[in-house]
């Protein structure tokens, strides 16, 4: 039994660090691996995270943290029994991808514009709260190529758009990401989406 | 909400022996790493011994190395700290403390004496 | 003798900024991170900043800690009377496996 393709990791910066592998062959990752996980600090011990299969020779693992600070770093050993087939390291804050946010309302009562909320997924004393920006992807249902992204750049987790800029009387949906800037993370992956009817009153037009 | 209360200071003679204990609520005690510090009368503190969350792992100060022994019950939520051949330089209020990557809570302290 | 090294004393008068210092020797090693306490009169210490610059939840963020190599420091911005305390810089010692305490510094709220 030998990796493929080492593990590599990924951490939401609050709790939980992602880590993904390939093995040489099918394997039933939770019986035959296990994932030994330990902060470099004086004090820490080595936790055990059981990974689950990701396709026939991949495997993945949900590395549980209490927290994260830009200093930590982490060793880690995969093994397959008695024997030890991998040993690396892991700094979480170099390796970051934001959580996704979540509750995306589209207000259409706002006159004639959209408005458009999320929640930051981050409690306010978390470092990312405040550093994050986002994406927001609204695309027709019915037309393919009517797709566009919005670049929030700002804190709030809303967007204001006019309902003009959309085509009237079709259906919309809308997603929204984030990433921070600060620490050059990975873009989240997207909240799920949120479906609206567009109408909006044409301008009357004098001739 | 976290709480560390101390008890078993007191008065002792040069060359005998207390043991305190620390009782721990709040918290999953099994899981955190934990600490005694110690301030003497006017002075500053000093960090004495500390313990990993299962208790494999254990560390001392050199001035109470061979003397001290820290140890815990985690089915009591406890932590322990024996010491014995205790000196004058000894006396001081004694801090229980959970380990967060720092000294993150902390108790009251209880005093110990040592003098004839 | 502390392998850190703090000021024994500063002071300071309501609204201004204050700083403590906190050095490591020269051989200290400069690879663990910093932490800050904070004890009132009469009571138990409170951590301020655990790894360098990271503020427990509760703590105003008129404090503020900053590492440099083997040393670090301690910002008040805002003092206020009520921060009247000593203060105690410490930090992981691998080489001693142990944890390393600052001789502590008093600070004083002037008039």
């Known amino acids: 039994m030998k990796v493929l393709q080492e593990p590599t990791c990924v951490s939401d910066y609050m709790s939980i660090s992602t880590c993904e592998w390939k093995m040489n062959g099918p394997t039933n990752c939770s019986t035959e691996l296990r994932l030994l996980y330990q902060l470099v600090f004086l004090l820490s011990e080595a936790h055990t995270c059981i990974p689950e299969n990701n396709g026939g020779a991949g495997c993945v693992c949900h590395l549980l943290m209490d927290d994260v600070v830009s200093a930590d770093n982490y060793t880690l050993d995969l093994w397959a029994g008695q024997q030890l087939l991998w040993k690396g390291s892991f700094k979480p804050s170099e390796h970051v991808k934001p959580r996704a946010p979540g509750n995306l309302t589209v207000h259409t009562n706002v006159s004639d514009t959209l408005l458009l909320t999320w929640s930051n997924p981050y409690p306010p004393d978390n470092y990312l709260y405040n550093h994050l920006t986002y994406a927001v992807n609204i695309w027709s249902e019915n037309d393919p190529a009517d797709f566009r992204i919005y670049n929030v750049t700002y804190l709030e987790p809303s967007l204001r758009i006019a309902a003009s800029t959309l085509k009237s009387g079709i259906s919309y949906r809308a997603r929204v990401r984030a990433w921070a800037q600060c620490y050059n993370t990975t873009w989240s992956e997207w909240s799920p989406s949120t479906k609206w009817h567009n109408s909006y009153r044409e301008p009357f037009e004098q001739h | 909400e976290v709480q560390l209360l101390e008890s078993g200071g007191g008065l002792v003679q040069p060359g005998g022996s207390l043991r305190l204990s620390c009782a721990a609520s709040?918290?999953?005690?099994?899981?955190?790493?934990m600490a005694w510090v110690r301030q003497a009368p006017g002075k500053g503190l000093e960090w004495v011994s500390a313990?990993?969350?299962?208790?494999?792992?254990?560390y001392y100060a050199d001035s109470v190395k061979g003397r001290f022994t820290i140890s815990r019950d985690n089915s009591k939520n406890t932590l322990y700290l024996q010491m014995n051949s205790l000196r004058a330089e000894d006396t001081a209020v004694y801090y229980c403390?959970?380990?967060?990557?720092?000294?993150?809570?902390w108790g009251q302290g209880t005093l110990v004496t040592v003098s004839s | 003798q502390s392998v850190l090294t703090q000021p024994p004393s500063a002071s300071g008068t309501p609204g201004q900024r204050v700083t403590i210092s906190c050095s490591g020797s020269p051989l200290f090693p400069d690879s663990g991170s910093f932490n800050w306490y904070q004890q009132l009169p009469g009571t138990a210490p409170k951590l301020l900043i655990y790894?360098?610059?990271h503020r427990p939840s509760g703590v105003p963020d008129r404090f503020s800690g900053s590492k440099s190599g083997t040393s670090a420091s301690l910002a008040i911005s805002g003092l206020r009377s009520e921060d009247e305390a000593d203060y105690y810089c410490?930090?992981?010692?691998?080489?001693?496996?142990?944890?390393?305490l600052g001789g502590g510094t008093k600070l004083t709220v002037l008039g």
């Open positions: 709040g918290f999953t005690f099994s899981r955190h790493a």
């Open positions: 313990i990993t969350s299962s208790g494999r792992s254990i």
């Open positions: 410490g930090t992981w010692d691998y080489s001693l496996s142990g944890y390393v």
């Open positions: 790894a360098d610059s």
């Open positions: 403390a959970r380990v967060h990557r720092a000294f993150d809570y």
